[in-house]
Amino acid sequence: ELPSPPSVWFEAEFFHHILHWTPIPNQSESTCYEVALLRYGTGRWNSISNCSQALSYDLTAVTLDLYRSNGYRARVRAVDGSRHSNWTVTNTRFSLDEVTLTVGSVKLEIHNGFILGKIQPPRPKMAPANDTYESIFSHFREYEIAIRKVPGNFTFTHKKVKHENFSLLTSGEVGEFCVQVKPSVTSRTNKGMWSKEECVSLTRQYFTVTN
């Protein structure tokens, strides 16, 4: 009998649901993995892939209703010719709570001494038209914003905002300002991921002189 995959787990962002597993020890070139999925409430395991040689599988297309369902469990077993292992099942139920929150983009502009920021929620192609980030997380959206001045590797101001727009009064400071954003939903336990840094340069020309 083949050994079972030591662990199986989901790593998910908004409408990007990837199942991962660790390989069995001493696998051969012909070892592959079978993936099956259980939707809570159906009591039935569905085979998704009979023979995947990768160590991950994109289950987004078959879990599109994740955000409006009771969640899923997945299981994986090793297959080598006619031999197969026992199933290894995910430890936890895969539900909305397991999805890591991200932002789509952060747009920055400068206006009259303010850095104005606009946070764009993620817009994955796979998401059904009615399942936007704002409709699924319709309340208590929050964002942590970290700004640093370049050069320097320190965060010099850090703020939580409760909407997708923010403004920082630069008070005459000039230089390059780099911004990162991390989303959260205060009523939920989902982890958030920091966005990639967006930078904007502020020079004296952006300040309006008033008497």
Epitope: K159, K160, F166, L169, S171, G172
Partner: nanobody, 127 residues
Framework: EVQLLESGGGLVQPGGSLRLSCAAS????????VGWFRQAPGKGREFVSA????????YFGDFVEGRFTISRDNSKNTLYLQMNSLRAEDTAVYYC????????????????????WGQGTLVTVSS
């Protein structure tokens, strides 16, 4: 008028930690942005950190590099500065200060934005 009184300074070895406190009395502390400045021997005052009235915004000087944490407890009218991984160059008198206004602004990196000041507490980092 806000009165501010710092405590928690002292002698600490390089790499060590200290927690400074600033107790406020007088006008309502909870409506102010409050912060810490420091003054090393023979140098001018330097911004360390600040925090808005509700704690949702923090500011740090460029030398902090993640070593310090600022927090406040409005129910106790107290401001805190947790300092970790202290270095010899952190030796200074640390002052607590309070400003008015709430806009998210880099003005709070400036000494001139603060109307109320404490007397200071000395932090010495030496082996």
């Amino acid at each position: 008028e806000v009165q501010l009184l710092e405590s928690g300074g002292g002698l600490v070895q390089p790499g060590g930690s200290l927690r400074l406190s600033c107790a406020a009395s007088g006008r309502t502390f909870s409506s102010h942005t409050v912060g810490w400045f420091r003054q090393a021997p023979g140098k001018g005052r330097e911004f360390v950190s600040a925090i808005t009235w509700n704690g949702d915004t923090t500011y740090f000087g460029d030398f902090v590099e993640g070593r310090f944490t600022i927090s406040r407890d409005n129910s106790k009218n107290t401001l805190y500065l947790q300092m970790n991984s202290l270095r010899a160059e952190d030796t200074a008198v640390y002052y607590c200060a309070a400003a008015t206004g709430q806009v998210w602004s880099l003005q709070y990196l400036r000494e001139s934005s603060y109307a109320y000041w404490g007397q200071g507490t000395l932090v010495t980092v030496s082996s």
